[in-house]
Interface confidence: low
Amino acid sequence: ALPAKPENISCVYYYRKNLTCTWSPGKETSYTQYTVKRTYAFGEKHDNCTTNSSTSENRASCSFFLPRITIPDNYTIEVEAENGDGVIKSHMTYWRLENIAKTEPPKIFRVKPVLGIKRMIQIEWIKPELAPVSSDLKYTLRFRTVNSTSWMEVNFAKNRKDKNQTYNLTGLQPFTEYVIALRCAVKESKFWSDWSQEKMGMTEEEAPCGLELWRVLKPAEADGRRPVRLLWKKARGAPVLEKTLGYNIWYYPESNTNLTETMNTTNQQLELHLGGESFWVSMISYNSLGKSPVATLRIPAIQEKSFQCIEVMQACVAEDQLVVKWQSSALDVNTWMIEWFPDVDSEPTTLSWESVSQATNWTIQQDKLKPFWCYNISVYPMLHDKVGEPYSIQAYAKEGVPSEGPETKVENIGVKTVTITWKEIPKSERKGIICNYTIFYQAEGGKGFSKTVNSSILQYGLESLKRKTSYIVQVMASTSAGGTNGTSINFKTLSFSVFE
């Protein structure tokens, strides 16, 4: 049978390297040789390229080499397939070389801010060494912030006579590091170069863009003054690299603005000792380029009643995240402050906090919390300048098996009964929320029994035991990840009771 007709011919001119054409060969049952026939020099000349590979996948491609390729030019390309039964020709295809030229990528050699121009970086590059002198180049520049995965793109063209191989990328975030890549193509071509190697650049610094402010209220001291720990951090969306030289804080009683106190600090928290009345606290951050907008917070009076609106709250782990959800009875509350810190016996030093708006849930990546640590999580409703009563729960981002079992004792040994008591496992050893305890007991040489009780129970009475018999007993504490046994204890039931 005649060979199948070659279809889907496609040609690419790898500029100043080679012109490669490929095609779909069809299902060949016998050895087929292909010849690519070309006319070039605007139809003045012609030549052939013959596939010489014996493997079928390499036989569907053929290349013409320099010096018999110049641009601009028009080509006709036709592929002939030949086997022992005859020859079949493809359709004639027509190509303008400048439409199919593909260059090497450009080389970015510098990405820099331009002095005094905010939110802009200038990209400088070297044109591909091998690019048509007679054609303009078009470019796609893609960029993203270093901690993002999604690219933005801009397209532009450069005149071939343009010595200035630069592009000013504007509308960026201040003091932010960007990753830049560039590709180019001959203006008339449908083939883009590969992307250049990525290069980093940073926009100029600006005045800080703002602060978030929070407080921890402590009980009043003997003299009626109350310690208030002020906490602050860069506003959400502030540049990651934003630098601050210091903070100005001023505060005054709500009833008398004339009693304003001011302080400066370079720390990210401050302990104030305020009177029992309500206060306003304001602050700004500053750097060498200016000041941030003012952040303000109201501190309620000691006797002030705070509103309550959170009715129920729960935490669960889903897809590598700890999710906290709550229900509120106040429809007008749509901002919440979340506080979380490890439940350790000492004073919490590592209080973290974050605000949530327009939602009644909060998520945090599991890996931002320590595994097997219990966290206290509180949610404060916020309405205008008022902060409501918090709702608190405990949760683990990841539970493990307790690192030790309960310390167990045997009491009130009788003829057929005994009381097993155990202590709660220390917080640091629990590794999760204890959901239940299981008591395992077994007479010497006899069958084993077990009984599971909920985590609020710390003792259990065993009944229907055999008299004058040795038993072994063990208590297991379980979290959602599994259980750990305490040490086993031996006891022997009495042979008779005083009541017998």
């Epitope: 080389k107 050699f109 510098r110 190697q197």
Partner: antibody
Framework: EVQLQQSGPELVKPGTSMKISCKAS????????MNWVKQSHGKNLEWIGL????????EYNQKFKDKATFTVDKSSSTAYMELLSLTSEDSAVYYC??????????????WGQGTSVTVSS | DIQMTQSPASLSASVGETVTFTCRAN??????LAWYQQKQGKSPQLLVY???TLAEGVPSRFSGSGSGTQFSLKINSLQPEDFGSYYC?????????FGGGTKLEIK
């Protein structure tokens, strides 16, 4: 710990060529550009050029484009500089130096110990 | 090529003193300037890049300043290990060029 270990001192005859090696360790060799620098008379420093080990792409100071050729061997994390048609003017200490890259190109944050080349008949 | 000029060519100072080296470019190089220290018989060591950023592990007594064409490197409270030669180098494109150096000697 980042280290650039260069080959030892060389005494060569005028008109000959020679190759200096620079073995990198303690970092990802293909992730950083390698610069070559000449120091004459223990004073003047001159940038000869650079090579990107990732793709073998080289950039030369025009002054040295016919004097030096850079190559890399990714498998052994080694950069090489061949000096051609040596004359007494080429007697100097030659350094390889890693480009800091994140600090802006052409900032050399780690240097080899230097290779002393003496051209004499 | 951009020319870098350092002054003075040499200077003497005592331990505990403050010294300043200057470096001038013959055209605007913005903040693209690095400083290196080189001790006798050793390789240069990066001290400062982008005119004022200290390289990793460099003591805080070193500080860089300047932009455009005029730059300086200041060492507060000189230590015995600070004596040697200091070179500036622009990193504003290719080819990067070095200054002629300033030799700091013990008085």
């Amino acid at each position: 710990e980042v280290q650039l270990q260069q080959s030892g001192p060389e005494l060569v005859k005028p008109g000959t060529s020679m190759k200096i090696s620079c073995k990198a360790s303690g970092y990802s060799f293909t992730g950083y550009i390698m610069n070559w620098v000449k120091q004459s008379h223990g004073k003047n420093l001159e940038w000869i050029g650079l090579i990107n080990p990732y793709n073998g792409g080289a950039e030369y100071n025009q002054k040295f484009k016919d004097k030096a050729t850079f190559t890399v061997d990714k498998s052994s994390s080694t950069a090489y500089m061949e000096l051609l048609s040596l004359t007494s003017e080429d007697s100097a200490v030659y350094y390889c130096a890693r480009d800091g890259y994140d600090d802006g190109p052409y900032t050399m944050d780690y240097w080899g110990q230097g290779t002393s080349v003496t051209v004499s008949s | 090529d951009i020319q870098m000029t350092q002054s003075p060519a040499s200077l003497s100072a005592s331990v505990g003193e403050t010294v300043t080296f200057t470096c001038r470019a013959n055209e605007n190089i913005y903040s693209y300037l690095a400083w290196y220290q080189q001790k006798q018989g050793k390789s240069p060591q990066l001290l400062v890049y982008n005119a004022k950023t200290l390289a990793e592990g460099v003591p805080s007594r070193f500080s860089g300043s300047g932009s455009g064409t005029q730059f300086s490197l200041k060492i507060n409270s000189l230590q015995p290990e600070d004596f040697g030669s200091y070179y500036c180098q622009h990193h504003y494109g290719t080819p990067p060029t070095f200054g002629g150096g300033t030799k700091l000697e013990i008085k």
